[in-house]
């Protein structure tokens, strides 16, 4: 689709003559008829296949034609066409005389032709005007012409339609050949995809307009190339999101346990021994006479109950003193002034004389002890039960009642709750004091990962301890935002637990 444009510049008919030799009276009032058609080696009559146009009277005899952009007498003349421009044409320009005041050229008699010219040849589409001049014996016509494409048409033959756009469906201009040229910052067949910030990670980042980089969940940084470690990860890094790979010297699920705590912090006092183990990352073994988590407390000299036979102990500056009850004497009240005649043995104990009757010894029945069998045996005083087990006296023996997760005579053996694989669907098991905790894979939740998440991963309430749940990129993913004091992918661990 395009327009053949013909600019008439000057017509000269000095003698005011018609083509048949007659004179115009009072002069040749001149208008033009233009016929544009397909190329013909020999111009013939017939339809103007590319279009035709007539002008009103433009002047008398000889005149210059001025450019006029609107109304009647428009110059250049416009011959629009709705087809592919073939590159060749035939053009017939006829000058006619109309005698009357009626300016409608079609009322002109058939014998009023002044002159005609015929141009045949090739013409490429372009903005440059081709100028020409045609003479015959009586007249001269100066003119120029060109072919340009209609709005939105491009290419050598005006056959390529292109309408520029800058909206959500595309951002482009049209090249001279009609192909699309993306506006800066856009790409794609229709220039509808923004070009992200240079270096923005292809998978982990995206953009909604040019030169930005928006990170997908689990990624951060200007170019979205840094993973976000697990919420609560203290001394660790990640290579994929939500991971917590511990730095050297750190351990535990959240890399918050110092594996060299003893060396780094020297927490144990008063010559005690430090070992890198235990719930806090270290344990202090105290020398005799000291106690406390860090062996920071000196024991009372009376703490070992040195006074016998009911003697009462009194602390002194670097020592102690026993106040003996009647009938006893010595540093620890270990000597008695009593004999078997005084029946000193209680609770059915039998008395045996010693040192030719000057002293005695009591033989105690089961469950009683003391130099006078005055003490009931408490087999639990030595705290024989480990790991928080409860000691119970059972007649002549004692038993340990173990906490969940422990077994053995002294509750010294740890039962792994995870040994029986309680976590379904590939869940990861963690042994905790109150039983096992399962960390579930994407798509499952519940205490044992037994609940399949169908749509909204947060609907089942997978986050513990009042944490807030957020769904991830896909409906089966979620992230728990833990409140203060809790960590873990589901906020299931209190801070400080292994």
């Amino acid at each position: 689709s395009g327009i053949f444009q013909l600019r008439l510049q000057e017509f000269v008919n000095q003698r005011g003559m018609l083509a048949n030799g007659q004179s115009c009276e009072p002069g040749c009032r001149t208008f033009f008829r233009i016929c544009l058609k397909h190329f013909q080696a020999t111009f013939s009559e017939g339809p103007c296949t590319f279009g035709n146009v007539s002008t009103p009277v433009l002047g008398t005899n000889s005149f210059v034609v001025r450019d006029k952009n609107s109304g009647s007498g428009r110059n250049p003349l416009q011959l629009p066409f709705n087809f592919t421009w073939p590159g060749t044409f035939s053009l017939n320009i006829q000058a006619w005389h109309t005698p009357g005041d009626d300016l409608r050229p079609e009322t002109s008699p058939g014998n009023s032709l002044i002159s005609q010219i015929i141009i045949q040849g090739s013409l490429a589409v372009g903005k440059i005007w081709r100028t020409d001049e045609q003479n015959d014996t009586l007249t001269r016509l100066s003119y120029s012409y060109r072919v340009i494409c209609s709005d939105n048409y491009y290419g050598e033959s005006c056959s390529r339609l292109c309408k520029k756009r800058d909206d959500h469906f595309g951002h482009y201009e049209c090249q001279p050949d009609g192909s699309l040229s993306c506006l800066p910052g856009w790409t794609g067949k229709y220039c509808d995809q923004p070009i992200c910030l240079s270096g923005c990670h292809e998978q982990n980042g995206y953009c909604s307009k040019p030169d930005e980089c928006i990170c997908r969940p689990g990624w951060q940084g200007r170019l979205c190339n840094e993973c976000i470690p697990h919420n609560g990860c203290r001394h660790g890094t990640c290579s994929i999101p939500w991971q917590c790979a511990c730095d050297e010297g750190w351990g535990g699920l959240f890399c918050d346990q110092d594996l060299n705590y003893c060396t780094h912090h020297s927490p144990c006092k008063n010559g005690s021994t430090c070992s890198n183990s235990g719930p806090k990352g270290y344990t202090c073994t105290c020398l005799p006479g000291y106690t406390g988590e860090h062996c920071e407390l000196g024991l009372s000299k009376c703490a070992s109950n040195p006074c016998r036979n009911g003697g009462s102990c009194k602390d002194q500056e670097n020592s102690y003193h026993c106040l003996c009850p009647p009938g006893y004497y010595g540093q620890h009240c270990e000597h008695s002034t009593l004999t078997c005649a005084d029946s000193p043995c209680f609770n059915g104990g039998s008395c045996r004389e010693r040192n030719q009757g000057s002293s005695y010894a009591c033989e105690c029945p089961p469950n009683f002890t003391g130099s006078n069998c005055e003490k009931k045996v408490d087999r639990c005083t030595s705290n024989p039960c480990a790991n928080g087990g409860q000691c119970q006296n059972r007649g002549p023996s004692r038993t340990c009642r173990c906490r969940p997760g422990f077994t053995g005579t002294h509750c010294e053996l740890h039962i792994s709750d995870c040994a029986r694989s309680p976590c379904a669907h590939g869940g990861t098991c963690h042994d905790l004091e109150n039983g096992p905790v399962c960390t579930c894979p994407a798509g499952f939740s519940g205490r044992r990962c037994e609940v399949r998440i169908t749509h909204d991963a947060c609907a089942s309430g997978p986050c513990f301890n009042g944490a807030t749940c957020y769904t991830g990129l896909s409906p089966n993913n979620f992230v728990c935002n833990c409140p203060y004091g809790f960590v873990g992918s589901r906020c299931e661990f209190p801070v400080g637990l292994p």
Epitope: N152, L161, H168, F169, G170, D192, Q193, Y206, C207, S208
Partner: antibody
Amino acid sequence: QVLLIQSGAEVKKPGASVQVSCKASGYTFTNYGVIWVRQAPGQGLEYMGWISAYNGNTNYAQKLQDRVTMTSDTSTTTAYMELRSLRSDDTAVYYCARELGSSFDYWGQGTLVTVSS
Amino acid sequence: SYELTQPPSVSVSPGQTARITCSGDALPKKYAYWYQQKSGQAPVLVIYEDIKRPSGIPERFSGSSSGTMATLTISGAQVEDEADYYCFSTDNSGDHSVFGGGTKLTVL
């Protein structure tokens, strides 16, 4: 081949919300947009809006702007259209279609949403 | 709000040429797209970007655009062409997209 499969028919009460899904297959989901069009019984087509499957950018028809939300999930190659505060004149067949350069060349089968008290 | 205006109905005899018009102020600068919808079916794209025909659409379907008017022409209409036809375009800003009201083509 390119397929757009929409969720099943819905019956809703006035004031409720509806979500229609459109599962795409057979082409690179993020290289195209998705448009939503509705057609009330005996009426013409009404453009509702567009979403870029690549970055989630949206363009909504002015009339529905306050009530419609379009989203897409690249992991499941599914587009969603949610319409809130339903009225009886929202009763229509809702279509999704694939978009490139504002041509809508493949269409879903349509989802009938009926709003009735 | 932007509008595209179509005649409600057009009737032709089989073999005749059917012309369906669509007028809109932005059409000199914006493309027109044409969709065919047969009863109870989803729409089908028959012309895009004013004049282009997707593969699989018969050659009798053609499009043109001049000024504020876009035209869908069906040369030698057939009985199976009986359907509703909708034009689609955007306003000058590109922010508002609309379908025309639709034209029911009857091939008697």
